[in-house]
Structures are given as C-alpha cells and as structure tokens.
Amino acid sequence: QTWYDSLGAINKIQDFLQKQEYKTLEYNLTTTEVVMENVTAFWEEGFGELFEKAKQNNNNRKTSNGDDSLFFSNFSLLGTPVLKDINFKIERGQLLAVAGSTGAGKTSLLMVIMGELEPSEGKIKHSGRISFCSQFSWIMPGTIKENIIFGVSYDEYRYRSVIKACQLEEDISKFAEKDNIVLGEGGITLSGGQRARISLARAVYKDADLYLLDSPFGYLDVLTEKEIFESCVCKLMANKTRILVTSKMEHLKKADKILILHEGSSYFYGTFSELQNLQPDFSSKLMGCDSFDQFSAERRNSILTETLHRFSLEGDAPVSWTETKKQSFKQTGEFGEKRKNSILNPINSIRKFSIVQKTPLQMNGIEEDSDEPLERRLSLVPDSEQGEAILPRISVISTGPTLQARRRQSVLNLMTHSVNQGQNIHRKTTASTRKVSLAPQANLTELDIYSRRLSQETGLEISEEINEEDLKECFFDDMESIPAVTTWNTYLRYITVHKS
C-alpha cells in the first residue's frame, strides 16, 4: 500500500514538473498601461484541466439507469470559470469603472490583477506597483496616522492632501490628540463610515501606479460618497491609473472606460457614450430608473443584476421590465415526486425564508460600532455596499434535465426545507424592517412588497403552512431574469464563508 501511495505521489510530482511554464503576469516597472488579454480564470488551481478530464470521462461513463454520470453532470455546474475571456486596456491616468451583476466576478478581476488568483488562460500586463482598497474596511490597533501611513515613508503634504480628500479632517479635529488618537483596544471605536474613509486613505496614501478600489464607499451616505469620489478618486488621483468597482451611474459616466461583467463574462467594454449607443435599451433602463444612484448599494446591484439578465448578449431578445411571462410553477417527473405535501404561502402567512432582522444599528447593511459581525444564516439578499453575494443560490449541486428546472427545484427545496434541514429558518418578527427575497438578484415583486408590509404589521411567530397549490398560482418564472448557472465565484464564496 505504501509503495502504491509513493508511486502515486511520484507520478503527480512528475506531471507537475513536465508542465509547460506559463507566465500569465507580466510585471515591468516601465509599463505605463494596464492590459488584460483573453483572461479566463477558475477559483481552483488546475480546475480547467480537471474540468476537461471530467468531460472526457463523462462521455465514456454512464450510471446504471442510463443517465449521464451524476458526478460529472454536477461537476459541469461547478466548473464555470469565474472570469471568461476578459479583455481591457487602460492607459496611465485613466479610470476604469467595473460594474456588473451580483457574483459576476468583479472582485475576482481585481484578484487576478494582483496575482492572488492565477488565470488558466490569457495575459495580464502592468508595472506591479499596486495599491488595493478592499470592500471590507479594517483598522489596525494604533493611531489614525499609523493606520494610514504605516510602512510607507511619511510625506506631510501628501498625508494632509489624503486626509482632506477622504474627509477625515473633521473627524480628526474632534479629538484632543488629533491623528494620534489610538484606535482599537483601549482606544476609540469608529463608525463604519470612518473605517471606510481610513481604509481608503491608507490605500490612496501609498504611492503606486495602479489603484484597485473594490467598492470602497461602503457605509458612506450618498452625499459623502459623491464628494469623496470627486475629491479623492477624480482629483487627487487624477494622474494615477485607477480601477473602481462600483454600481453607480455617476461613476460610470465619469470613467474613461467601463467594463460591465455578467456571470464572469464581459457584457460590455468601452466608454459611457459607446454604452449608450451600442446598448441603448440597457443604459436607458438604468438611467431611466428614478434616482438610481440614491438607492442603497444592495438595491442598485439588484437592479443591475436583473437588467443584465434581461439584456445579456447570450440571452434572447431584450424584454421590457413591464412585461412578465406568467409561466406556471409546475414540475413534472422526478421533481414533482420530491416535493412535500404542504408548502408555505407567502400571503396567508409571512414567508419563512429570507427574512433578515434589522436593528437600528443595522439599517441598509450598516453594522455600526458592533464588536462582532452578525451571523449570516438566513438572508439570500446580498447585504451592504459589497454587492458580491456571499450566500449562493441554494442547491448548487442539483441535477435535472434542464438548468432552469434545477433552479426552480433549488428554490422549492429551500422553501420546503428539503435542503439544509438543520438550518433554523423560523424567526420571531420583532424588528420593524425586513428584506424578503427569493434570490439575491430578484427585484421586488408585488408579493415581496405585500409580505414586507405584512411582516411589519405583525409580531407573531411565522408558523402557518398551507397547500402548495396556492403557491403555484402566485409564483412565476421570468426566464430572462433567472440565471441558469450558479457561478463558481458565488459557490466558492459560500464555501469560504462556511468552511469553519
């Protein structure tokens, strides 16, 4: 047995050593532009290769009932690359705005640029001098000044400029110790907005050729965000190359180039005027949406996701938001047999799934001054500024004749508790604000609004269950708005979040 194990290990080492060396990242300090050519990436090293092997094996292997091998039909669902054939080129001093649907791979794109995620295909070229601002702001124990300049040589003028651009002057002036006030243990506790601005200041203060800003305006109100975008991203950093992940139309308009991602692919790349010319329906849909930029980031992402599903280049002809395909929620064959006899009715009772309690400190995803992050067991709605869904669409590894059927069944499984039996999805409705949604990317239907209103008017525990036939009449699919494939990115995030 030991001999066989050793032989296996030797073979693996041999395979690895015989692989052709493939250089995807090109660092050259003289490079002034940032280029990405035909980049495809999976979240697992060697996943693409494994995927090809799986497909080959699938052709030769059948299960006893004659269906395709269960493992490999599932595998194809997981094997979706997180980024597919992405191309862009930005010159020195340009701003690239990256927008896209929830789980589309926006953060993954930045990870590829930083070398944290290695592409399976394509080339990336930049100088290698990068500064990154994460969507999750953080504070190290120490002074405000230390948080911004730690590890970087001190330049008074630069420091003052950054403090001003990130609107930290007012905060600092409130303390007797000014920017020498200690944060963290034994020091003061910051609000989410203050953390966000310090994190942004830390990234901006560092001298780099390329600044990667991943939804950096979390927890900031609309006005502050607008001002900091202008003063910091547009003015202070005007001569720097910047890539900003955003969901704001204002940012897209101001950007030199726009990259819109959808399910890992490039839906659009070009200027804002080109977007209006080439995708008039898409851009007018967003711009025509009253006060789009005033919505919460979560709502913006939801609208953007919905719009991209409808106008995706791979999909059918664009469908107007006013149209609704009233397709009955009916399953046949094996799917029907798996159902429970009774199912929740969202009108006669409040939906048992996806109800998020909110405390006054947690409105719109803001977790101010909390020592520990709240557990995120229930919500299928992506919370806060971040936009990347951390919970996946349920039942990632489901089987069935069509992807649409898988999708419907996964929702059914969720509603009937047939997946994740151990998860407690009963909650007392004690708070006044809730989110109700079937999927992270779905925009509110009349049922959502009704359920939300109902949930605000009652203090009872949700317990009523009625026959599933009632639900069929009020649960419809709009095929354009439902993504067929669960993205690997979203799945990986789920595994990462729940690995411990």
């Epitope: 944290e116 500064s131 990154f132 999750f136 953080w138 963290g184 520990e372």
Partner: nanobody, 117 residues
Framework: QVQLQESGGGLVQPGGSLRLSCAAS????????MGWYRQAPGKQREPVAI???????RYAEPVKGRFTISRDNAQNKVYLQMNSLKPEDTAVYYC???????????WGQGTQVTVSS
C-alpha cells in the same frame, strides 16, 4: 471567535535568525489583515509587519529589509522571518488578526524573542 497560536520564539545571538509562526483557528472565513506586533519591556505594543488582503505587506521602519512577513491563506497561517536580529528586537511578539465586516481584532498569547550574546 478567532484563536491565534504563536510559535518559534526563543533565545538567539545578535545577527541570528528566527522564524515565528501563527496559526488561526475558529471563524477565519473573512480575514481582512494579519500581522505581527511586539512589546518590549516598559514600552507600548507597536506594529512590526502587516499583510492585508490583496497581498499588501508593510513593515515598521526599524525592521525593513531584515524581517519578512508571509501568509498561507489556505491554512490561515502567518509567518515572520526575522534575519540579522539585534538586541533591540528583544520583545514579546504578538500575532494579530483583523476579521469580519466590523473590523474585529484578535490577538495571540505572545511569544518571547530574546536577542542576546
């Protein structure tokens, strides 16, 4: 909650090297940054080296060029390679981790590093 366990400290001669290790366990799903702080006798705890998301690594001025921080994201470990050690590097070295959406700080128990001839 997150637990941190340091190892690798000890007595070393000036000019020598040590490698500190720190393993994180518990709710390590959303790590924002990891690093090392030190506290010399009679002094305040100060940052030594920090590695944040995106691979950004930063060092305190006195240790630049001598210390190297590295991370194993898969195993939630952070290391500090300390070369050309000086007597003034003598301190208790603490592993530090920042995690979660609300920027929670966690600390290890500390490991003693003594540089003496």
């Amino acid at each position: 909650q997150v637990q941190l366990q340091e190892s690798g400290g000890g007595l070393v001669q000036p000019g020598g090297s040590l490698r500190l290790s720190c393993a994180a366990s518990g709710s390590t799903s959303s790590i924002n940054a990891m690093g090392w702080y030190r506290q010399a006798p009679g002094k305040q705890r100060e940052p030594v080296a920090i590695s944040s998301s995106g691979g950004d690594t930063r060092y305190a001025e006195p240790v630049k060029g001598r210390f190297t921080i590295s991370r194993d994201n898969a195993q939630n470990k952070v290391y500090l390679q300390m070369n050309s050690l000086k007597p003034e590097d003598t301190a208790v070295y603490y592993c530090w981790l920042n995690w979660g959406r609300t920027s929670v700080n966690s600390w290890g128990q500390g490991t003693q590093v003594t540089v003496s001839s």
